[in-house]
């Protein structure tokens, strides 16, 4: 009786169970009554990452420098190439097909998390007692100057965009 289902790492074809090709190899010919499945290794620029019956290997991803991409990890016959972005850029999507410049945090916001090749800058509003007066992809919110430690007094209150202005204490009493 011909099988209706096959074991793991096998597939059903012409009423018989044939072995799948291992990762890194493509299917050339199904098994026959005389021989096992014929598989061949993927070529230099190709890969297959699972046990498969694919008759063509997949091309490795191309990290296009014109799109700001560079190779993070070279592909093998069993893995795809992993691209990442050049310095100052990050991936536009999870598949990282192109890159965009890191965003800067505007005045009043500081960098909570510096961007990487795969993630954008994360900004946060400067809380009370902190400020940022620049547009930057690196600078965190900075604390207001402590006038007291300098034996000075606050002449102008700070905001999320400006530091306090300290001045000498009024000695006229």
């Amino acid at each position: 009786e011909p099988p209706t289902a096959c074991r793991e790492k096998q597939y059903l074809i012409n009423s018989q169970c044939c072995s799948l090709c291992q990762p890194g190899q493509k299917l050339v010919s199904d098994c026959t009554e005389f021989t096992e499945t014929e598989c061949l290794p993927c070529s230099e620029s190709e890969f297959l990452d699972t046990w498969n019956r694919e008759t063509r290997c997949h091309q490795h991803k191309y990290c296009d420098p014109n799109l700001g991409l560079r190779v993070q990890q070279k592909g093998t016959s069993e893995t795809d190439t992993i691209c990442t972005c050049e310095e100052g850029l990050h991936c536009m999507s999870e598949s990282c097909e192109s890159c965009v410049p890191h965003r800067s945090c505007l005045p009043g916001f500081g960098v909570k998390q510096i961007a990487t090749g795969v993630s954008d800058t994360i900004c946060e509003p400067c809380p009370v007692g902190f400020f940022s007066n620049v547009s930057s992809a690196f600078e965190k919110c900075r604390p207001w100057t402590s006038c007291e430690t300098k034996d000075l007094v606050v002449q102008q209150a700070g905001t999320n965009k400006t530091d306090v202005v300290c001045g000498p204490q009024d000695r006229q009493r």
Epitope: N14, V28, S29, T32, L40, P41, S43
Partner: antibody, heavy 116, light 111 residues
Framework: QLQLQESGPGLVKPSEILSLTCTVS??????????WGWIRQPPGKGLEWIGN???????YYSPSLKSRVTISVDTSKNQFSLKLNSVTAADTAVYYC????????WGQGTLVTVSS | QSALTQPPSASGSPGQSVTISCTGT?????????VSWYQQHPGKAPKLMIY???KRPSGVPDRFSGSKSGNTASLTVSGLQAEDEADYYC??????????FGGGTKLTVLG
């Protein structure tokens, strides 16, 4: 049972094009095997791989013959073909077609003589 | 790529064992477990006897066996019989969907 049969002229003039066809019967050219090959054997000499074709048309050629050889496929006729340009007497051989890269099925071969 | 190197001839008496070698490089025989052996009788098409170094198609007698060490593959025919007299060719995958054959070995069964 899978069978392969080569056909084409047995005599070709020097500098002309050698053309052969392999007809597959007992199975489809686009299922069970997905790659098909050509091999030749000059009289009294050894086997030489010419090239292979994927049923969707991708081709793989021997580096030594690459500049002169073209392999094509016609799935509707269950055939694949060989063309060899600018032939010389050195191309006189028995030409075989075969299945896959393992070559577990062969045609019976056809002798092609290059002579004027 | 160059043809794989086989001895031009080998011989043995009926019942004996004979081994035919097939030497390539690390880019073909040594680099892949894709060595095949073919038997060819005069005027006939070659017949696959061994594939993937040591696997035998069903129907091929178990007197035929294959092995590989480094860049050299071997075909051993044990219990030699008169019908084993033929030419034997090895082939190997050579990367990038390329194949290469050996030059062939004429096996003679003595007596």
């Amino acid at each position: 049972q899978l069978q392969l049969q080569e056909s084409g002229p047995g005599l070709v003039k020097p500098s002309e094009i050698l053309s052969l066809t392999c007809t597959v019967s007992g199975g489809s050219i686009s299922s069970s095997s997905y790659y098909w090959g050509w091999i030749r054997q000059p009289p009294g000499k050894g086997l030489e791989w010419i090239g292979n074709i994927y049923y969707r048309g991708d081709t793989y050629y021997s580096p030594s013959l690459k500049s002169r050889v073209t392999i094509s496929v016609d799935t509707s006729k269950n055939q694949f073909s060989l063309k060899l340009n600018s032939v010389t007497a050195a191309d006189t051989a028995v030409y075989y077609c075969a299945k896959g890269f393992r070559f577990d099925y062969w045609g019976q071969g056809t002798l092609v003589t290059v002579s004027s | 790529q160059s043809a794989l190197t086989q001895p031009p001839s080998a011989s043995g008496s009926p019942g004996q064992s004979v081994t035919i070698s097939c030497t390539g490089t690390s880019s073909d025989v040594g680099g892949y477990n894709y060595v095949s052996w073919y038997q060819q009788h005069p005027g006939k098409a070659p017949k696959l006897m061994i594939y993937e170094v040591s696997k035998r198609p069903s129907g091929v007698p178990d007197r035929f066996s294959g092995s590989k060490s480094g860049n050299t593959a071997s075909l051993t025919v044990s219990g030699l019989q008169a019908e084993d007299e033929a030419d034997y060719y090895c082939s190997s995958y050579a990367g990038s969907n390329n194949l290469v054959f050996g030059g062939g070995t004429k096996l003679t069964v003595l007596g």
